[in-house]
Amino acid sequence: MAVTACQGLGFVVSLIGIAGIIAATCMDQWSTQDLYNNPVTAVFNYQGLWRSCVRESSGFTECRGYFTLLGLPAMLQAVRALMIVGIVLGAIGLLVSIFALKCIRIGSMEDSAKANMTLTSGIMFIVSGLCAIAGVSVFANMLVTNFWMSTANMYTGMGGMVQTVQTRYTFGAALFVGWVAGGLTLIGGVMMCIACRGLAPEETNYKAVSYHASGHSVAYKPGGFKASTGFGSNTKNKKIYDGGARTEDEVQSYPSKHDYV
């Protein structure tokens, strides 16, 4: 039961995380105009991975897409790539994990297959989460660098009276969404990997037969329980894993087949 819960929770957490990564990637507020210690402007500038926006004091908002590909900073391109890779891996991971869920039965899929799929999706979620965290962190680092550079040259003058106030940008909401979402996806992935260990069928002694020295009786003990043995080292409780096909009655994996809802 605990394995099913862990797997289910891992799936849900990852699902929320990936939804968050998609939301963060689409959001316009990756960087927002720093309002602290700056002249009060009648406009509010903010930028995303795909476009930059300006909200005027009237409420009028105008957004312009980055229509160039080659003209964009390499770091921005790298962040875009990381986020997209994160989304793609996460989406594939979700697809795989749906079929791997213990509570969902697809034909006569073995527990070993479900375990492998759970592990695969878990690894995908972990990598997806790491991609998102890396992407957001690279962007944040870029912002911090630019922030201090623009603070150093806050007023770039041409001598005389004329001054140009440089707009400084600080962390936008999308960064926090991205960090949290990446973290959730990562946690979900770890939970899936943990669930995989519980799902993997342990070596089960299906044909443990013990012989008594007197030869009167033969005790047949299914399911890997220790048989009462008479003598001899060969009668030790060795677990034998029969990886072959099993009948429906034999498929009694850790939560029983009646545990699914």
């Epitope: 105009q33 002249p39 009060v40 402007t41 009648a42 406009v43 500038n45 903010y46 930028q47 930059s52 926006c53 300006v54 005027e56 004091s57 009237s58 409420g59 009028f60 105008e62 312009r64 004329v162 001054q163 140009t164 106030v165 440089q166 707009t167």
Partner: antibody, heavy 120, light 113 residues
Amino acid sequence: EVQLVESGGGLVQPGGSLRLSCAASGFTFSDYGIHWVRQAPGKGLEWVAYISRGSSTIYYADTVKGRFTMSRDNAKNSLYLQMTSLRAEDTAVYYCARGGYDTRNAMDYWGQGTTVTVSS
Amino acid sequence: DIVMTQSPDSLAVSLGERATISCKSSQSLLNSGNQKNYLAWYQQKPGQPPKLLIYGASTRASGVPDRFSGSGSGTDFTLTISSLQAEDVAVYYCQNDLYYPLTFGQGTKLEIK
């Protein structure tokens, strides 16, 4: 037709108070920020204050900060400027002006103005 | 505060002639976020409230004749009346629309020569 009509001006003694009103019609009042701008006799224009659509943001000129309070009642399509501790230099024609929606923050419609005279 | 300086203070131009008014700001009115200039021009006729002519440094407000045009970027802006008409006699103001407090130029009085 967009109309802004100011009222409440008059003669007041220095240190006194006055409340100006601006009645709006011909547009959805709650969709626009409104400014107060004044013009002293024979002088140029001086921006006084601004209030956003939902009153969440209010800005004042340094010359009136702490003395003037701007407010609005969207249900009544009305704007107010409460003026206290009035000085002789506050004598002017006071205009309310609508902040245009897509006019780069410029004021696209103005009222006819109301005259405030501060004198003893 | 942003200081807006207009020149000249007064200008006399013959009917049908070109009139040019200059406006300089102490800081750039070009917003880096959208590369747009936040400067407006107003016309005020005697006994009337101001009327918006140009916003965004170069966009004519609705109902403004096309003889009025605005140009410039950053800190230097110009209002041009290509062919002066009698009804253009007024005081013209430029205004900073980017930084609070919003500030106006001192005004340029345009008269007919």
